[in-house]
């Protein structure tokens, strides 16, 4: 069986998926749903998952949610929030994805894959 995916490959694939869901949109991402903004710092994969997991019925981000869970060491369920959330700001999923994508690109360029 294939071995574990290298962190660099996993991060690149997450970036590619985020780019993919923003391309050629015919309708607003997740119907314009709002999510909590997060601090893009240590532990942000879990924080991003905690925020996005509360969006239901949005098939466009299901793969992203699965991929984020691979970066998060603990199980995340809807309604769960860590201290990493800026719990006073809600933004559209489309904007959340832009913020996350930019941060991940910077991590990838800097060689910070974990």
């Amino acid at each position: 069986s294939p071995g574990p995916v290298p962190p660099s490959t996993a991060l690149r694939e997450l970036i590619e998926e985020l780019v993919n869901i923003t391309q050629n949109q015919k309708a607003p991402l997740c119907n314009g749903s709002m999510v909590w903004s997060i601090n893009l710092t240590a532990g942000m994969y879990c924080a991003a998952l905690e925020s996005l997991i509360n969006v239901s019925g949005c098939s466009a981000i299901e793969k992203t949610q699965r991929m984020l869970s691979g970066f998060c060491p603990h199980k995340v369920s809807a309604g769960q929030f860590s201290s990493l959330h800026v719990r006073d700001t809600k933004i559209e999923v489309a904007q959340f994805v832009k913020d996350l994508l930019l941060h991940l690109k910077k991590l990838f360029r800097e060689g910070r894959f974990n």
Epitope: Q25, A27, P28, E92, D99, L101, L102, K106, R109
Partner: antibody
């Protein structure tokens, strides 16, 4: 290919309200953020604000009290209203599409010149 | 408010490399986008998210961003590259907004 076309009066009197429309063709207006940006002759670009299909807006704080943006998804059009116009508002006004994956602008209209004069 | 500072002008000979800077407080933490604008035309995106190129933009255009300075580099400059260049960032704060640099006139001498 996405195309943006601004339209509106070329001349506005001082203290009046400017109304501009941006018609989008070749793509859906519903799935992107849209901005208005202006450029006085011989000067740099100034961001006016942005709007999403939900109607949510962000405005330049220096213009906030005078700006209203709206979106009509059925007509694939955006509109900009800027009140209490002065000579300092004379500029080329552009509408632009924010990229889906970043905060950059990947499509721009050709711009429309608005002159404020009595 | 957030300010982006660009040199008003940069001159370069054909075939040489032009570097246009964009300074801002901790700009390295932001995504920087660069536009080329020729007289009488709308701006055209040439680099986004620091160093990515839109399709159709030559590889001669590249970008970097760290610390307090972002840089647009144009290698093997051609006469057709003469234009105004603007940097732009999105400032995510309590008051979300877009900021443009003042622009740099690139002259090919």
């Amino acid at each position: 290919q996405v195309q943006l076309q601004e339209s509106g009066p070329g001349l506005v009197k001082p203290s009046e309200t400017l109304s501009l429309t941006c018609s989008v063709s070749g793509g859906s207006i519903s799935s992107y953020y849209w901005s208005w940006i202006r450029q006085p002759a011989g000067k740099g670009l100034e961001w006016i604000g942005r709007i999403y299909m939900t109607g949510r807006t962000n405005y330049n704080s220096s213009l906030k009290s005078r700006v209203t943006m709206s979106i009509d998804t059925s007509k694939n059009q955006l509109s900009l209203k800027l009140s209490f116009m002065t000579a300092a508002d004379t500029a080329v006004y552009y509408c632009a599409r924010e990229s889906g994956s970043s905060y950059s602008y990947d499509y721009w209209g050709q711009g429309t010149l608005v002159t404020v004069s009595s | 408010s957030y300010v982006l500072t660009q040199p008003p002008s940069v001159s370069v000979a054909p075939g040489q490399t032009a570097r246009i800077t964009c300074g801002g407080n901790n700009i390295g933490s932001k995504g920087v986008h660069w536009y080329q604008q020729k007289p009488g035309q709308a701006p055209v995106l040439v680099v986004y998210d620091d160093s990515d190129r839109p399709s159709g933009i030559p590889e001669r255009f590249s970008g970097s961003n760290s610390g307090n300075t972002a840089t647009l580099t144009i290698s093997r400059v051609e006469a057709g590259d003469e234009a105004d260049y603007y940097c732009q960032v999105w400032v995510s704060s309590s008051d979300h907004h877009v900021v443009f640099g003042g622009g740099t006139k690139l002259t090919v001498v």
